[in-house]
């Protein structure tokens, strides 16, 4: 008697870019001798019950080929991470996984003064975004002036993985001579968001 | 024979409704995702909408969305599309089909809607 | 949205001639690519699928390449019936699939 098999082919790729809040679906055929009798997705070592299906190609009884979809809607950057596929039949299991990375705008974790002088800025979304400073003298509302951060770094995300990127930059609030206020932007190739430091009151945050 | 059969088409007017309906036969219907495909007359084709076999996940094409509804009957074999608030711009002929992985395997002959005052 | 085009938009050709018709995505899409065959006034037809796999029932004179934005079906010796019209479409971003525009193969 020949010996059962599991051929897995993603039918779309394995590493997935998804936007914040859109639909994907991971969908994989596979072909399985003798029929496969259990399949499963797993999240995080997490099981789904629903947002999936199992059909077969046709339903001749000669039939070894099937497919299997996971519906995952409205996808959140928590979400990201290993999306596992496993099949098996009475002779053997085989799985696949998909990469999902959730793009993610970026959003300001925090904007302080420090006691050195330095104005830090820590921002975090996928991919990792980008901070810009920018001077604007007095009451002006645009800031156009841009400024040399002192210091960037990628930090790490203490979420899981394929979570958002942390950044931190730096800049010498010693280096302005007026009052005035500056901007801290932070982008990617989501969207942007900025937080400004007035000189002559206490910072705000203004997400745009 | 695996068959898929479309009605309901026909002319209506802007801002009106219609509701297609798609006849199955020949598999196991609510085995598999279906889904509706349009193409205006001499163009391509363009993705509708796709519905899980259970009927719980329904997306949508950004042109349709918050105007078509996608639905089935399982114990009828059957699948349908609820259009309101029509334009000029869905003027196509629309079909059926059966899904299979990310393209359509089984195909329906198509229902002609027009959109016209 | 990933663009799918074709080239050619039409192309004439004779009964055994080798057919070639090319498809490019906007974006990589790996081989998630399906290409459908259609007749004026009938449905769309599955011919390939995942770039390169023939659905069942189609000849074997149809065939699929192709990996990352340019994809070919290519059509080895054309037959009678083999006159119609062509479209690709990607699954890469399921569930927003997308068409190509089409490419129309007439008898010369």
């Known amino acids: 008697v020949d010996k059962g098999f599991i051929n897995i082919f993603p039918m779309i790729n394995t590493t997935v870019f998804v936007n914040d809040g859109e639909n994907v679906d991971l969908i994989v055929e596979y072909e399985a001798f003798p029929k496969p009798e259990h399949q499963q997705w797993i999240y995080m070592n997490r099981t789904f019950t629903d947002k999936w299906e199992d059909y077969p190609k046709s339903e001749n009884e000669s039939n070894i080929r099937y497919v299997s979809e996971l519906h995952l809607t409205r996808l959140k950057g928590t979400e990201g991470g290993t999306y596992t596929f496993l099949v098996s039949n009475s002779d053997v299991n085989a799985a696949i996984a998909f990469n999902v990375y959730v793009n993610t705008k970026p959003e300001i974790l925090t904007y302080d003064r420090l006691v050195n002088g330095m104005l830090q800025c820590v921002a975090a979304g996928f991919p990792e975004p980008t901070i810009d400073w920018y001077f604007c003298p007095g009451t002006e509302q645009r800031c156009s002036a841009s400024v040399l951060p002192v210091d960037v770094q990628t930090l790490n995300s203490s979420g899981p993985p394929f979570g958002k990127l942390v950044v931190q930059s730096s800049i010498d609030s010693s280096a302005f001579k007026h009052n005035g206020t500056v901007e801290c932007k932070a982008y990617n190739d989501v969207g942007k968001t900025s937080a400004y430091f007035n000189f002559a009151f206490k910072e705000q945050i203004h997400p745009h | 024979e695996v068959q898929l059969l479309e009605s309901g088409g026909g002319l209506v007017q802007p801002g009106g409704s219609l509701r297609l309906s798609c006849a199955a036969s020949g598999f196991t219907f609510s085995s598999y995702p279906m889904a509706w495909v349009r193409q205006a007359p001499g163009k391509g084709l363009e993705w509708v909408s796709v519905i899980s076999s259970s009927g719980g996940y329904t997306p949508y094409a950004d042109s349709v969305k918050g105007r078509f509804t996608i639905s089935r009957d399982n114990s009828k074999n059957t699948l349908y599309l609820q259009m309101n608030s029509l334009r000029a711009e869905d003027t196509a002929m629309y079909y059926c089909a059966r899904r299979y992985g990310g393209g359509m395997d089984v195909w329906g002959q198509g229902t002609t809607v027009t959109v016209s005052s | 949205d990933i663009q799918m085009t074709q080239s050619p938009s039409s192309l004439s050709a004779s009964v055994g001639d080798r057919v070639a018709i090319t498809c490019r995505a906007s974006q990589s899409i790996d081989t998630y690519l399906n290409w459908y065959q259609q007749k004026p006034g009938k449905a769309p037809k599955l011919l390939i699928y995942a770039a390169s796999k023939l659905e069942d029932g189609v000849p074997s004179r149809f065939s699929g390449s192709g990996t990352g934005t340019d994809f070919t079906l290519t059509i080895r010796s054309l037959q009678p019936e083999d006159f119609a019209s062509y479209f690709c479409?990607?699954?890469?971003?399921?569930?927003?699939?997308?068409f190509g525009p089409g490419t129309k193969v007439e008898i010369k």
């Open positions: 479409q990607q699954s890469y971003s399921s569930p927003g699939i997308t």
